[in-house]
Interface confidence: low
């Protein structure tokens, strides 16, 4: 299962499979997730250790039993890989680290006006993996505003140093935000030259391409098919790079296939998993387990559920079968790829789906109407759960926000449907940033069912919550994925980093905004909130947020949208934008429906609708 809790002041002892430098525990966790054998990690922040060599150390670990002994270490952070965590699996890392210099090979330097511009340059450079930016207050004047683009053999910094007035970060290519664009073509009977960065065995060129896409230094590849003339090179996938970023030469060669990494694609990256099953093929590797199951699909599911399993072979040999069940060989290797691929067998083989980010519907466990006043523009993929609820009568207009909480479910405010209960008039847009990008050809979701809380009454503030079941399930991408729900009975006191997003008015008498806005707002206790709203009852099923001095708030058009808070590296849906006195007025906080108080209702409705739980809140 998916385990996302972090252990503070704890270090896992033993089980090391790799180590590197990372700027924080979340990035370390991501590297663990994508490492073929890593199940656990431990991270040492600069403050936790005097040994300069071990500062920012990220230690990736494996364990046969799925656990390792934890020892107390002040400041250390440990946790689990996010393999099997569905939509939480992402190689995208947007954070900027202030006061930190991430070292590597500096291959390009230029003057820029901001760290965001530096990150953009890195994202738009084919070889850049991470960067450092010297701010205007850097102690050496000649280095001020320098943007250094960097790479390293492993894609992570070769060292990380604490350095004032320096800011560092990673390329956003894994966020599908590169402007470079990508080559989707696969070139038959063509071999690329240049430097091999790795060699793995794959059953076809498509798996080879996906591995190349997620390898830190692979820019293009050549695959030797299973009929290649040299037997020892059959099914070999060579991952390649070059100084220029493109192959310096290519040679026509029978039974070879070449292509490019898709990391520079804009808006869509391939999933970091391989779902195809290969009949008549055996995958060799270290035996993890053998089990009797009915059918190759169950074998793949069994492999996916056993977190250490990387690939499998389902044998149909008579001696491997009993009644309707046959042997399912669960296997693994050092690099996550088979150590041998044999053809013409009575088996079928494939890979674990543990890194698929569509995942199960129920993967969201503890990881990771009212325009926003005083907010700033959001960027692509920053709030991938935000949806726009629009009504198409004669014209089409944005009316409310909402939050994607499952493949087929959106959570919003009940009052959005006051006077507009007909589901046919609604269009739901997901994975968008600018409302102006919506044209008649933009895909949208239609509503199958609107479920308004049974105790909601029009023009009252209580139970302002509604579920929308979409007619068709949505696929998850970097720009369209669900928000985790809180635990039932969560106390909001743990949340200190909360944001409200929406396209609503930027002032009380304003208009709908084009670019999705975001604003960081602190939560306010219910007692404080009640003092500000003496004519209304602030119940325990509401949560309030706002600044005493006002100036930042949700407003008309934000209703139904999310109030999300980040805790332990994970975003959770704490509130649904509901009501308030005006917008951003002094001492008049915004009032939000408290999602934790409605967890039973949400789970009941999403289960009873089709008999299967569609999302799961943290344990």
């Amino acid at each position: 299962g998916c385990l996302t809790q972090l252990y503070e002041n704890a270090f896992f002892r033993g089980g090391d499979v790799a180590s590197m430098y990372t700027p924080n525990a979340q990035y370390c966790q991501m590297r663990c997730t994508f490492h073929p054998r890593c199940l656990l990690f431990s991270f040492l922040p600069a403050s936790s250790i005097n040994d300069m060599e071990k500062r920012f150390g990220c230690f990736l670990k494996d364990s046969v039993t799925g656990t390792l002994p934890k020892v107390h270490r002040t400041g250390a952070v440990s946790g689990h890989s996010l393999k099997q965590c569905g939509h939480q699996i992402s190689a995208c890392h947007r954070d900027i680290y202030k006061g930190v210099d991430m070292r590597g090979v500096n291959f390009n330097v230029s003057k820029v006006s901001s760290v965001e511009e530096c990150q953009k340059r890195c994202t738009s450079n084919i070889r850049c993996q991470f960067f450092s930016y010297a701010t205007q207050t850097f102690h050496k004047a000649e280095y001020r505003n320098n943007c250094l683009l960097k790479y390293s053999p492993g894609g992570t910094p070769t060292a990380i140093k604490v350095l004032s007035n320096v800011e560092s970060g990673f390329s956003l290519k894994p966020c599908a935000l590169s402007e470079i664009g990508c080559h989707m073509n696969i070139f038959q009977h063509l071999a690329f030259s240049d430097v091999d960065v790795a060699r793995v065995l794959t059953p076809d060129a498509f798996v080879c391409r996906t591995i190349c896409t997620y390898h830190p230094n692979c820019l293009f590849f050549t695959f030797y098919t299973n009929v290649w003339k040299i037997e020892s090179q059959r099914n070999v996938c060579l991952l390649k790079t070059s100084e220029s970023g493109t192959p310096s030469s290519s040679t026509p060669q029978e039974n070879t296939i070449s292509g490019y990494s898709l990391l520079t694609c804009k808006r869509t990256l391939p999933e970091p998993c391989h779902s195809k099953i290969y009949p008549g093929v055996d995958f060799g590797g270290e035996e993890l387990n053998v089990t009797f199951v009915k059918g190759v699909n169950v074998c793949q599911e069994t492999c996916t559920k056993m977190i250490r399993c990387q690939f499998f072979t389902y044998s149909l040999l008579p001696e491997d079968c009993k009644e309707e069940k046959c042997k399912c060989f669960l296997r693994l290797s050092m690099d996550g790829s088979p150590t041998r691929i044999a053809y013409g067998t009575q088996g079928s083989s494939g890979y674990s789906l543990r890194l698929c980010n569509t995942g199960d519907n129920s993967v969201c466990t503890t990881k990771t109407s009212t325009r926003i006043v005083g907010g700033t523009n959001s960027s692509w993929g920053e709030w991938p759960w935000q949806v726009s609820l629009q009504v198409k009568l004669t014209a089409q207009r944005h009316l409310c926000g909402g939050s994607l909480i499952g493949h087929q479910w959106v959570l919003t405010a009940a009052h959005c449907f006051d006077g507009l209960p007909l589901q046919d008039v609604w269009r739901i847009y997901s994975g968008i940033l600018n409302l102006s990008d919506i044209t008649k050809d933009t895909p949208f979701s239609q509503i199958k069912e609107i479920i308004i809380h049974q105790n909601y009454k029009v023009s009252e503030g209580n139970h302002d919550i509604a579920l929308i079941k979409l007619q068709a399930p949505l696929n998850y991408t970097e720009f369209q994925k669900p928000i985790c729900l809180p635990s039932k009975g969560d106390t909001s006191t743990i949340y200190t980093n909360c944001w409200v997003t929406g396209w609503g008015f930027s002032k009380e008498k304003g208009e709908i905004q084009n670019i999705l806005q975001k604003v960081n707002i602190p939560l306010v206790t219910n007692e404080e909130c009640q003092k500000r709203y003496q004519d209304y009852k602030i119940t325990q099923r509401m949560v309030c947020a706002g600044y005493k001095e006002g100036g930042k708030d949700a407003c008309k058009g934000d209703s139904g949208g999310p109030l999300v808070c980040k805790h332990n590296g994970m975003w959770r849906l704490v509130g649904i934008t509901s009501w308030g006195e005006g917008c951003a007025r002094r001492e008049q906080p915004g009032v939000y429906t408290k999602v934790a108080e409605y967890m039973d209702w949400i789970l009941e409705k999403t289960q009873s609708s089709d008999g299967k739980a569609q999302m799961q809140s943290p344990a």
């Epitope: 002892r13 033993g14 364990s63 046969v64 039993t65 069994t302 559920k305």
Partner: antibody, heavy 117, light 107 residues
Framework: QVQLVQSGAEVKKPGASVKVSCKAS????????MHWVRQAPGLGLEWMGA????????AYNQKFKGRVTMTRDTSTSTVYMELSSLRSEDTAVYYC??????????WGQGTLVTVSS | DIQMTQSPSSLSASVGERVTITCKAS??????LAWYQQKPGKAPKLLLY???GLEAGFHLRFSGSGSGTHYTLTISSLQPEDFATYYC?????????FGQGTKVEIK
């Protein structure tokens, strides 16, 4: 094939220590954790802890913390479990067990430790 | 620690009978459950584990089911060689813990 061969039966006095060995063969010794499980006469099974022979890392059941020590000798592919301050209720068969996936697929033949004055 | 409660503690059954043993965990163990068979004077033998894993060497008449905190082991048609003590064990959270055992005797 995987084999776990344990040392012979021991009789100890209360307050003494016992050290049981478990010699592994048929697989890469440093790749898999070795666990210890005990079974008192007529009673159920009780997990005592584990050692990762590759790293030397250990995990102990809190119940035995301070009394149990697990070590390994990679040159002979042997793990050891030492239990100190023995009392009569420590009379049990002690098993070493190796996981396959997660549960214990391979077990030693067991070592009977009798604590008696 | 997670407590594992097995029931019944013993049962008598005839060859060919269907037998069910239950195991209740004190908290959710997310299907991280193994079943072992032990015969007198011998080490336990892994029988079933996880959601689908039937250990090689055991017949398909053994099956496991359950989720959350409730799990069952079923022997569809008891054979003479099945008379033994059966233990459940959780491997969700250390310390790993076992049920107290169910002794299956010949009626």
């Amino acid at each position: 094939q995987v084999q776990l061969v344990q040392s012979g039966a021991e009789v100890k006095k209360p307050g003494a220590s016992v050290k049981v060995s478990c010699k592994a063969s048929g697989y890469t010794f440093t790749d898999y954790e070795m666990h210890w499980v005990r079974q008192a006469p007529g009673l159920g099974l009780e997990w005592m802890g584990a050692i990762h022979p590759g790293s030397g890392g250990t995990a102990y059941n809190q119940k035995f913390k301070g009394r149990v020590t697990m070590t390994r000798d990679t040159s002979t592919s042997t793990v050891y479990m030492e239990l100190s301050s023995l009392r009569s209720e420590d009379t049990a068969v002690y098993y070493c067990a190796r996981p396959y996936g997660y549960p214990f697929a391979y077990w030693g033949q067991g070592t009977l430790v009798t604590v008696s004055s | 620690d997670i407590q594992m409660t097995q029931s019944p503690s013993s049962l008598s059954a005839s060859v060919g009978e269907r037998v069910t043993i239950t195991c209740k965990a004190s908290e959710d163990i997310y299907n991280r459950l193994a079943w072992y068979q032990q015969k007198p004077g011998k080490a336990p033998k892994l029988l079933l584990y996880g959601e689908t894993g039937l250990e090689a060497g055991f017949h398909l008449r053994f099956s496991g089911s359950g989720s959350g905190t409730h799990y069952t082991l079923t022997i569809s048609s008891l054979q003479p060689e099945d008379f033994a003590t059966y233990y459940c064990q959780q491997y969700w959270s250390t310390p790993w813990t076992f049920g107290q055992g169910t002794k299956v005797e010949i009626k």
